[in-house]
Structures are given as C-alpha cells and as structure tokens.
C-alpha cells in the first residue's frame, strides 16, 4: 500500500496542503516565545524550553517526542571573577580595562543570566606581553607576517579581527605561530554596513557589542571528552589533557570601542597593504608592541572561565512512516543560544516548530508520510555541535542503515536579499524543482517563482540560468550526518547581497542585540522570508519523505566530480616539475570520474523505466540512491581528522565554515613547496589521489545493476 492510499488527501494536493498550512504569523509568534530570555546550553532555562517544545510537538500530533540527554564538556565564565583585558604600565598598574559586558538593549535591562562575552573553552590564564595585529588570523595572514614581514609572534599576544574564517581556525593558527594569547574583535569594516544605524536603530553592531563563540578545533569529534562515542551515563571520559580540540592559550573577544583603545597605540611595522586595514581611526600597525611614548606599556589578559561537564537535552520527535517506517528523513536545528538567539538559532527553531505543526495537522486529518520523519531540537550546538553529534554517535548504526536525508534548520535568515542553499549534489534537482513551485517573497518579483528571483540575484558561476548552490562545509549540525555518516544533507536560509555587503555574517551575530526586535523591525517585519524558508525546508522534507522514488539525481554528482577533479588537477599543475619528478598522475581519478558518469547515466535511465509498482525493485533502486552518499565515506577518515570521512567534501582545514572538495588531495598539496621532505610530501599526494580514485570508482559500482 503506498502512502498516498493511506491518506484522505489526494496525492497531488499532499504537498500543497502541507505548504498552505504554514503561516508567517505562527512563525512570528513562535520566534517571540523562544526569544524572551536567554537559552544558553546547560542552563535550567534551556531545559525548560526543551520540555516546552516536547509538550508542544506532542500537541501538534507527532507519534512520540522524547528528550535525549548527554553529559558533555561545556565552558562558562566565572561569575565572581570576570574576564577582561588591560593595558598595564611599567609598574604593572592597569591603566585601561576592557568592558565586562555589553550594555543591555532597550527593554531587556532587567533580564538576568545574560552570559558576558567570552570565548568558550578558553583556558584560564593571565598572560602579558606585546601585541601583534594579525589581520583575520588566517593561514595566509600568518604567512604574510612570518615569511614576508619576518615578524615573530612567539611569546606575543595577538589581536585578530573576526570574519572570513571560523574563529577556532584563527586560534589554532595563533597557537601554531607561538602566540601566548589571542584577542578577537569585531571591526566596523566587517560588522558595520555603511548607511545603516547601529542597534537599536538598525541592524549594525554598536561599539560595545561583542561576538561570543566557541574556539574549539574538534574536527567533528563532538564532546571533547568522549570522541566517537555518546556521552552517556556509563561513558569513559578522557582527562582534560587528552580532550579533543581544546585551545592551549587564553582567548577573549571584545567590541570595537575597546579594540580602538588597544590598536590606537600600536607601533612597529606598518600594515603590509590596504587589505589589513579596517575602518577604525587607527594606523593598523602590526607591531610588535606599542609606539614610542607607550612602548613600556603591555597588554595583559585576565581569563578565568571554567570547563564543566554539564547535562544537555535534545528533543527528538517522530512521525512514523506509513510504508517505509525504517527509512528516516531528519529535520534538525539547534535550540541553544548565546543570549536571546533572535536569529541564531530561534529564527530557525520557529520555522521547525511551524513545520512540525503543519505535518501534525495533516497527520490529524489521517495522512502519514511514506517514510518516517524525525524532528530534532539540538542542544549545545554553540559549544561545538555537541547535541547533534552525541545523538548521532548513539544512533549511528541505525542512521547508517536507515538515514535517507538530513535537512538542517539553524538561522532562517542572515539577510533578506535572496535564498542561499548548500547541499549534496544529489539534492540539486530537488531544490530546483521545489523552488520553481514556490512564490518569490522578493520585492519586484511579485507573481514570479522563488527559482526566478534566486537565479537572478545569485546566479551560478558555471551554469547560466541556474542559481548558485554551494558546497556543505561545517559549523552546523549537519556535520556529523554528512561528513561522518555520509547521509545526504542540505540547508537553506535567506541571505544578504554578498556583492554589496562584504561584512562577515550579519553584524549582530552572537551578541546580546540578536533579539526578536532585530528580526521584527529590521530583517523581516512581515515574516515573509521566514515563511519562504519554511516552505523550502519543509518542502524538501516532504518530498524526501513522501516521493515514491527518492528525489536524488546521481548525474549531478557526476558533473561536480568532474569539476572538482579538474580543479584539483589544476592546483597540482602549478608544480609541473615535481609532478614529473615524482610521477604524479591523475589518470586514475579522471578514469574513475568517467566511469561514475557513465554508470550514473545508465542508472538514471533505469530509474525512469523500472516498474514502480514492484515494491522490491522500488526498494532496491531507492536503496542504491540512499546509499550513494554513504559510498563516499572512507572508514579510515581523512589524515589526522578521523571524523571527517567524506572523500569528496570536508570542512576546509583553514576555515571550518567552508567546504573543500577532494580535501585529502587538497591538503596534501597545500603549501607543498615549503615541505622539508618533498619526496614524502608528493608521496602523500599520490596516496590521496589513489584514495579518491578508489572511492569514486567504488561509489560508481554501487549504482551498477545489482546482478
């Protein structure tokens, strides 16, 4: 019996009924409800919200809703011993101190339990020394400093501006450079868009606003004390010295008012070029140390945060499938926030809530999806994707056998310009087809499809008439599902115009000013962009859970594999002499890609023609589609990153947020000209080509006729 026979809604109206039930006014109401107090991971307030969501999902009609708890390592400031940075004179007297907290936004003056800005998982320490300004603290910034400018960061405190790359990568780079402390700050060049007022009068960052965030380098490990396994009641925990990904030097974030006071005194080398200058009225001198008059003054950090094993709670809701209950489509987003979470995560959580309500309404009318849908409200995402990762570790055997797809649902908006989608190539056609059926919310596109406005505003750099879809990186809860388990994944949100707004993320990201009012006044007063994101995320889940044949097109994987192979080959060809010397060939990879393309093409033909009324053949074909993403997983993982196991995609080693293609080969080639043992280095390139070629070939064979 197909799921469509098990419903009192006619098949062609299933999706329409689901989408029509989604209401902007409900999303607005849910967002307000989720943002009135802070919901920091590990706190009583966030536990209460978990129980509220559990109760409401049950009311909405899900079959079951359970809390899944774990005891994981979290990090908090010391309530009685605040973190700050000072300038000290030659006598050791503090002549300037940074602020201890952000001034509260209007209407929130009397809210308690607002965690002050801090860098989660910073070790304690009170280092003092000369300051070095390191721009964004990217790999290339340290290359510029160390190799070109001959500036040594060893024993120095570095100050870096937020933006461009994940803050954890900045800290890792600073550690490798020998720094003894890191100060992170938000420069107006990156967090203050021209022509826009600062909060509460616009969406720009005020001078006292500060970005919180974790500074881990977990590489997909989850809880630092229980890598690979769930942090349950009988878990064996590593000692803190063996914990995964913890920084070894103190780190603290500040706003641009305080940064001004540190940077205005900087002496030493001038900035190497204009790309090192922000928008403050300071020289952006690199240092080390302060200029003439102030050369005896030093910077001192005072960091007293503590790491604590704390209980966290995921909410897991189940809507059982009518036909294939053992096939799971997962919609998940986090619930924990740094403060109010007006955008991150509650603009996403409110959308998930409305999607659950709509599915529940259909279920109450007698409908069920073909496949099981799991809904998740993850905890402790902000502390390193901990809730999602621990749950996936606990359920990995089920997920690797039954997981069809994972759709992520963090922030629904980071702007209000156009759609942004990152997903597996398997979902390209699903996203294209769905957005062609949805109305655009954009001004000037009334009566036009979302696909049309999206393509116009964010065109694909390769294919004319198509929209840009990006690679999945990390920094969000899809990581464990995609990068570790090989479950087809995707994410969608509304974004800014990257052409005109060069600032990083949105200005008030992870600050106390990320409030309900920020969204309601400045980003999406009618909640029409939220509704559109709900339609995209919900529509994807609906199709993945309800279509008879899984809406995956393996031919799109073939196209990108060729593109990625060309790209990595051209990177390698920057070293033609070494390729010749060490007999480096990409023939095996190109051959595997060619085989994949042919086999995928034949599989697609069979997919059009097979007898869909035969449940065994249908299940067989769907399993080949479901397991294709899984086939790109290397059980041994990437070098030094065992939990990043996808051979085609991994988070960049230089920026966790960005996706890198053929990451094993890419990392082997990176900065290869500086390696002390070129023979060994090129040997590793060859090994990585071999792994990639084998994996692509093996994946292709999963699409071959089974007998």
């Amino acid at each position: 019996k197909s799921s469509n026979e098990a419903t009192n809604i006619t098949p062609k109206h299933n999706m329409k009924a689901f989408l029509d039930e989604l209401k902007a006014e409900n999303i607005k109401k849910f967002l307000y409800n989720f943002t009135q107090i802070p919901h920091l991971a590990g706190t009583e307030q966030n536990f209460q919200l978990a129980k509220q969501i559990q109760s409401q999902w049950k009311e909405f009609g899900l079959d079951s809703v359970e809390l899944a708890h774990y005891d994981v390592l979290l990090s908090y400031p010391n309530k009685t011993h605040p973190n700050y940075i000072s300038i000290i004179n030659e006598d050791g007297n503090e002549i300037f101190n940074t602020s201890l907290f952000e001034p509260p936004p209007p209407g929130y003056e009397n809210v308690s339990d607002i965690v002050p800005p801090f860098s989660a998982f910073s070790p304690q320490g009170m280092p003092e020394g000369d300051l070095v300004y390191v721009n964004y603290a990217r790999t290339e910034d340290f290359f510029k400093l160390e190799r070109d400018m001959k500036i040594n960061c060893s024993g120095k405190i570095v100050i870096a501006r937020y933006g461009k790359v994940f803050r954890g990568n900045k800290v890792k780079n600073a550690q490798l450079a020998g720094a003894k402390g890191v100060i992170l700050y938000s420069d107006p060049a990156d967090y203050f868009a021209p022509g826009v007022k600062s909060y509460p009068d616009g969406w720009n960052l005020p001078g006292g606003g500060v970005q919180r965030g974790n500074i881990l380098n977990l590489n997909g490990a989850g809880d630092p004390l229980t890598p690979g396994y769930p942090a349950n009641e009988y878990a064996y925990r590593r000692g803190i010295a063996e914990a995964v990904g913890l920084p070894s030097i103190p780190v603290h974030p500040i706003g641009y008012y305080d940064a001004q006071k540190l940077l205005e005194k900087m002496g030493g080398s001038a900035p190497p070029d204009s790309s090192w200058r922000g928008s403050l009225k300071v020289p952006y001198n690199v240092g080390p140390g302060f200029t003439g008059n102030f050369s005896t003054q030093k910077v001192k950090m005072h960091i007293h945060s503590t790491n604590e094993v704390t209980r966290i709670y995921n909410v897991i809701g189940t809507l059982r499938g009518a036909v294939e209950p053992d096939r799971y489509v997962i919609l998940g987003g986090h619930r924990d926030s740094w403060v109010f979470g007006g955008i991150d995560p509650q603009s996403g959580a409110a959308v998930v809530h409305e999607i659950v309500r709509s599915f529940g309404t259909l279920k109450k009318e007698g409908w069920r999806p073909r496949r099981t849908i799991l809904f998740a409200s993850w905890d402790a995402e902000e502390f390193g994707l901990l809730g999602s990762t621990e749950w996936a570790e606990e359920n990995s055997r089920l997920l690797q056998e039954r997981g069809v797809a994972y759709i992520n649902a963090d922030s629904s908006i980071e702007g209000n310009y156009t759609l942004r989608v990152d997903c597996t190539p398997l979902m390209y056609s699903l996203v294209h087809n769905l957005t062609k059926e949805l109305k655009s919310p954009d001004e000037g596109f009334e009566g036009k499809s979302l696909y049309e406005s999206w393509t116009k505003k964010s065109p694909s750099p390769e294919f004319s008439g198509m929209p840009r879809i990006s690679k999945l990186g990390s920094g969000n809860d899809f990581e464990v599902f995609f990068q570790r388990l090989g479950i087809a994944s995707g994410r969608a949100r509304y974004t800014k115009n990257w052409e005109t707004n060069k600032f990083s993320g949105y200005p008030l990201y992870h600050s106390v000013y990320e409030t309900y009012e920020l969204v309601e006044k400045f980003y999406d007063p009618m909640f029409k962009y939220h509704l559109t994101v709900a339609q995209v995320r919900g529509g994807m889940v609906f199709e993945l859970a309800n279509s008879i044949v899984l809406p995956f097109d393996c031919r799109d994987y073939a196209v990108v594999l060729r593109k990625y192979a060309d790209k990595i080959y051209s990177i390698s060809m920057k070293h033609p002499q070494e390729m010749k010397t060490y007999s480096v060939s990409f023939d095996s990879l190109f051959s595997a890609v060619k085989n994949f393309t042919e086999i995928a093409s034949k599989f697609s033909e069979r997919l059009q023609d097979f007898d869909k009324s035969n449940p065994i053949v249908l299940r067989m074909m769907n399993d080949q589609l479901m397991f294709l993403e899984r086939a790109f997983i290397d059980p041994l993982g990437l070098p030094d990153r065992p939990f990043y196991r996808h051979v085609i995609y991994a988070p960049s080693s230089h920026n966790k947020y960005a996706g890198e293609s053929f990451p094993g080969i890419y990392d082997a080639l990176f900065d290869i000209e500086s390696k002390v043992d070129p023979s060994k280095a090129w040997g590793e390139v060859k090994r990585q080509i071999y792994v990639a070629a084998f994996t692509v070939q093996a994946a292709a064979e999963t699409l071959s006729e089974v007998a």
């Epitope: 952000e102 001034p103 209007p106 600062s198 509460p200 305080d258």
Partner: antibody, heavy 119, light 107 residues
Amino acid sequence: EVQLVESGGGLVQPGGSLRLSCAASGFTFSDYYMAWVRQAPGKGLEWVANINYDGSSTYYLDSLKSRFTISRDNAKNSLYLQMNSLRAEDTAVYYCARGGDYWDAMDYWGQGTTVTVSS
Amino acid sequence: DIQMTQSPSSLSASVGDRVTITCRASQDISKYLNWYQQKPGKAPKLLIYYTSSLHSGVPSRFSGSGSGTDFTLTISSLQPEDFATYYCQQGNRLPRTFGGGTKVEIK
C-alpha cells in the same frame, strides 16, 4: 560649528503646558540622537528624555512619561519637548543635547532655556 | 534605576595640583561612564566618554579610568579655567543618570 539653541521657556502656572524647541545647526541633524536634560535651581543634572534619529523611538524618565513628549522634525533641524500638567518641581533650566547613538555620551549642549512653574 | 554617587561633593585645590574625583555606580555599568564640566550659568561640556576617551578639544591633563562600578576623573595639573562643577553620567541603561556633582573650588 555645532550649535543648539533652545527656546520656548518662560513662566507658567501649575497645570499649564509649554512647548520647548531646540534649533540645531552645524551638523547633519538626522544622524544623531537628541536629548533633553534639566537642572533645577542649585541642583544637579537630570536626564529627561531622548529620541532616536528619525523619531521612531523615544525614551523617558519614568516619572515624566505621562506628561512630557519628545519629538523632532528633521526637515526643520528641530527638537521639541511638549510639557503638560506642569508642576512646581518641573522648574528648571532645560538643555537640549546631542548624542551619537543609543548608548553614546551627550557631546554638545545648548545654552538652556528656563522654565518656571509658579502661581 | 542606577544611582551614581560622586565624591567628594566639593574640594578646594590650588593651580598645579593633581585632582581626583570618584564616581560609584549602584550596579555594574561596564565602561559606559561619561564626565562633564559645568561652569556657573553655562551649559555642561563633555570631557570624557566611555570611561577614558577624551572628547575632541579637551586638554590631555584630563583623564578617566575605571570599569564596572568604580570610576575616576583625574586632572593631572589643575589650571585656573578648570574651577567648575564636574558630573559623571552612566550611559549603560535607561534612565540615564548623573552623579550629584563635585565642585572644584580655589583654595
């Protein structure tokens, strides 16, 4: 040069009304928060109200909220304070002041206008 | 509301003296503390904002420090034109509140 000139003060009976004005020049008026601060004879300074760039948000001393209204006309580079149901304790010099944003200091002040509430 | 307490309420000093005025907030105001100077019959003038930043045109003999609840205004070498009343003001939260003032008189 930044200039703020208050007017509209004077003698008024208890229960009466008065409208103070502040004419601004020498800067782009719509780029700044504006505020009213008062000083009773021989006393210290007391913040009364402020208003954001376009007048969409106003903030008051709680005890004055029901009687005083701050407003602005950016086209005329003018700030206003409408004071109703005046009381003897409202007697003070009223200063108009400029601020950068919601949290910023008041960096330029007018010379003040005197309001006397007496029967 | 946040109470701002200045001390001393008045002081006598001579030209060339180093003068320190303190301001205490009833709760943590971070660094959102401003200092103003007022001469008799005149409007207040901003001296220092955000605890320690000098407003344009203000002589460098004026400096500010502190954070949280305790703040100081220092005049390193008192000049004749510095005899006036000084007010602190918190800008951290509404309502904005001022200290009671410190009158600096000629000894």
